[in-house]
Structures are given as structure tokens and as C-alpha cells.
């Protein structure tokens, strides 16, 4: 994804352990725009800065995720960090986008591969086929070899997902296409869930 995600991650990584805890607690009670769902408490409290950034972007997308992070940081009295995000927001042109209403009245979710990260890590068995489909177009040679070096399917998928935060939508779509080819019934099962 883009600059907004990186800015959110930078801000969260600048928080102390206690501040990150406080950030999560405030995230559980902050007023959300109509049409957006809340990150489940149980999952939220376990997350480190990277996981939380991914979750913010997948639940709220970059524009609103950035705005929400700013709101919580201001509420915590961390004005300087919030201002840094404000600068990113203005530079990326996210202001106009964030001001619009969400498309449906149901809770917003992220890309399919973000939503089903845990299930995909647990249930994808033909990882090499997926890797071959992504090799060159999405994964560099080094990334491809790093994933293949892992011993179990789960470890391979976990390693593959460590690269996902830097991917744009077309990269995530490429992974989804590969999964639809190699694990169609898994994708259909997850779609129903």
C-alpha cells in the first residue's frame, strides 16, 4: 500500500508500550463514521504496531484509517505525532476522499487476502504453486526464495504475508487470482464465511 500506511506505522512505532495500549483502548471507544465497523477487542489487544497498522488499513482503508489514527493521537495529547500524519494526509490528497461517505451501510472491510489472513495461513497447502504464480510479477527472487526456504506450509504462508503490507491492490489481486486457481474451494468457503 501507499504513504498513508507507512505514516500510520511510523506513528504507532513511535509510541511506547503503554502509549500503544492506551491507543488501542481509545480505538475501542472512539466515535466511528457511520458505515464503519469496529476492530474486535480480543484481536485488537494482542496486536503489535505492524499488525495494528494492517488492521487499521484493512478495516478503514488508507484515507479514513489515517484520519482515525490522527483523531486518537490528538485525544491522547500527542499533537506532534498527529501533525506529522496531517502533513502526510495533505500531501497524499486523502482529505477529499476521507470526507466522503462509505459506499455501503455495512461495515467496511479490507481486501479479501487481508480479511482472511489467518485462515489462509492455516489452510493453504499448495504454497509452491501460489509462489510460482507470484514469482517475478509480485515477489522478487529474494522474497520467493525466502518463502520457499520455510519448512511448513503455515510458515511459508506466514512469510509470504510478511510481504503483503507493502503490496498495492493489484499485487493482492494477483495473490487472490492464484488462490482461486489453486485453492478454489477454500476461496469459496471463505467467501461464504
Amino acid at each position: 500500500m501507499g504513504r498513508a500506511r507507512d505514516a500510520i506505522l511510523d506513528a504507532l512505532e513511535n509510541l511506547s508500550g503503554d502509549e500503544l495500549k492506551k491507543f488501542k483502548m481509545k480505538l475501542l471507544t472512539v466515535q466511528l463514521r457511520e458505515g464503519y465497523g469496529r476492530i474486535p477487542r480480543g484481536a485488537l489487544l494482542q496486536m503489535d504496531a505492524i499488525d495494528l497498522t494492517d488492521k487499521l488499513v484493512s478495516y478503514y482503508l488508507e484515507s479514513y484509517g489515517l484520519e482515525l489514527t490522527m483523531t486518537v493521537l490528538r485525544d491522547m495529547g500527542l499533537q506532534e505525532l498527529a501533525e506529522q500524519l496531517q502533513t502526510t494526509k495533505e500531501e497524499s490528497g486523502a482529505v477529499a476522499a476521507a470526507a466522503s461517505v462509505p459506499a455501503q451501510s455495512t461495515a467496511r472491510t479490507g481486501h479479501f487476502v487481508d480479511q482472511h489472513r489467518q485462515a489462509l495461513i492455516a489452510r493453504v497447502t499448495e504454497v509452491d504453486g501460489v509462489l510460482d504464480a507470484l514469482h517475478g510479477s509480485v515477489l522478487t527472487e529474494g522474497q520467493y526464495q525466502a518463502v520457499r526456504a520455510e519448512t511448513t506450509s503455515q510458515d511459508k504462508m506466514r512469510k509470504l504475508f510478511s510481504f503483503v503490507p507493502s503490496w498495492n491492490l493489484t499485487c493482492k489481486d494477483s495473490l487472490l487470482q492464484a488462490l482461486k486457481e489453486i485453492h478454489p474451494y477454500l476461496v469459496m468457503d471463505l467467501e461464504q464465511s
Epitope: M1, G2, L61, E62, S63, Y64, A94, A96, A97, A98, A99, S100, V101, P102, A103, Q104, R108, T109, G110, H111, F112, D114, Q115, N168, L169, T170, C171, D173, L176, Q177, K180, E181, P184, V187, M188, L190, E191
Partner: antibody, heavy 122, light 107 residues
Framework: QVQLQQSDAELVKPGASVKISCKVS????????IHWMKQRPEQGLAWIGY????????NYNDKFRGKATLTADISSSTAYMHLNSLTSEDSAVYFC???????????????WGQGTTLTVSS | DIQMNQSPSSLSASLGDTITITCHAS??????LNWYQQKPGNIPKLLIY???KLHTGVSSSFSGSGSGTGFTLTISSLQPEDIGTYYC?????????FGGGTKLEIK
């Protein structure tokens, strides 16, 4: 409600280029990809590609790679398709369209622009 | 690219009839298939997604079935407003491809 408003019909000469616009309302442009379709008279629909304004990435049908360039301007909530080196084969109705939901395992197009008729003639 | 073959290319039926349009994919597309209706001079309208799911606001006289490579769109109790061209579209893989269309007319 979600709306996609396309620019008016264009009449251009062979060899020229054209930029068709698709202004969205009722949702944030960065929340969904915008896909483009081509329809020639008495022919079916062809998928040109999509652009995701949320991160600027695009995916093209190989048949239209080099012919079409997809962009977006977030500040005006507008997606664009630039078509170059136009010939009579490019004369068609072009539609912008948006998948109905984000996060599904595949796309189904529930929202369409009204179409822009492009005529390439000398 | 996945080829989508639709048949018949045109169809004439009487009011009240039940008609069936078929779509055949050149390879397995599971259930990733959509059906659209396009009335003359109008934009395509989504009818069915995921092979059999009726899109919001679409009349229950439309139904879809099939998986893998063979799919059907059925219109029961044909009405005057059902005239138009019907297209199938696969969403299994890029580039997305459409069937050639079935033009439906009323006798």
C-alpha cells in the same frame, strides 16, 4: 447513493488521443477500484482494465495495454481513461464501472456510468 | 484468456414463457460468473452474481445456476420489460471476459 457520471460524447480524428472522465459520488473514490469496459455496436463487452485510486495501481487487459492509460484525481473524485493513436477500431461506447463490494473474492459490477460514445472519423 | 461461449445468440419467445440462456466457459471458473441485462440504448444491469445469487432489487423471475464450465440463466414468466441483450461474464481470472450476448425478443 453511488453514482458514476461520465463525460460527453467525443468525435476525434484518426491518430489523435482522447481522455474520458468518470466522476464518482456517494462514496470515496479511494475506497474502490474503477474498471473500464468497451462496447462496439452490435458487439459484446470487453474489459479494458482497472485502476485503484487508493494506491494508484492499475491492471490492464493485454489487448488494451499501450492503448489505454487509467488514472485518477482524488481531489475531484474523478477517474480517467486516456486512449491514444486512435483508429476507427476504437470507435465504441466506453463505460466506467465499479464493483459492488470491496473485499469480495471476485468482482461483480453493480454500478455503471452512463457510457461515453467515442467516434473516430476523418 | 478464458473464452465465454453464450447460446443462443438470439431468441424469440412469447409472454409468459420460461426461457433459458446458457454460457460455457473454456476452463473451470467455479462459481465466479455474473449475468447482466442490457436494454436497447441503456447500460448493462447486474442480475445475478456468483452464478446463482440474485442481485439487490432484481425480479425473482430471474434465476441462475451452474458451476465449473456450464451455466444457465432462466427467466420465468416472460414480461415485455425483459427484452434486451443478456451477457455472462467470468470473474475467475484477468482479463475478465464476456459472452457474446443473447438478444431476447418477444414474439
Amino acid at each position: 447513493q453511488v453514482q458514476l457520471q461520465q463525460s460527453d460524447a467525443e468525435l476525434v480524428k484518426p491518430g489523435a488521443s482522447v481522455k474520458i472522465s468518470c466522476k464518482v459520488s456517494g462514496y470515496a473514490l479511494t475506497d474502490h477500484s474503477i474498471h473500464w469496459m468497451k462496447q462496439r455496436p452490435e458487439q459484446g463487452l470487453a474489459w479494458i482494465g482497472y485502476m485503484y485510486p487508493g494506491d494508484g495501481s492499475a491492471n490492464y487487459n493485454d489487448k488494451f495495454r499501450g492503448k489505454a492509460t487509467l488514472t485518477a484525481d482524488i481531489s475531484s473524485s474523478t477517474a480517467y481513461m486516456h486512449l491514444n493513436s486512435l483508429t476507427s477500431e476504437d470507435s465504441a461506447v466506453y463505460f466506467c464501472t465499479r464493483p459492488y463490494s470491496f473485499g469480495s473474492s471476485y468482482d461483480y459490477f453493480g454500478y455503471w456510468g452512463q457510457g461515453t460514445t467515442l467516434t473516430v472519423s476523418s | 484468456d478464458i473464452q465465454m461461449n453464450q447460446s443462443p445468440s438470439s431468441l424469440s419467445a412469447s409472454l409468459g414463457d420460461t426461457i433459458t440462456i446458457t454460457c460455457h466457459a473454456s476452463q473451470n471458473i467455479n462459481v465466479w460468473l455474473n449475468w447482466y441485462q442490457q436494454k436497447p440504448g441503456n447500460i448493462p444491469k447486474l442480475l445475478i452474481y456468483k452464478a446463482s445469487k440474485l442481485h439487490t432489487g432484481v425480479s425473482s423471475s430471474f434465476s441462475g445456476s451452474g458451476s465449473g464450465t456450464g451455466f444457465t440463466l432462466t427467466i420465468s414468466s416472460l414480461q415485455p420489460e425483459d427484452i434486451g441483450t443478456y451477457y455472462c461474464q467470468q470473474g475467475q481470472s484477468y482479463p475478465y471476459t464476456f459472452g457474446g450476448g443473447t438478444k431476447l425478443e418477444i414474439k
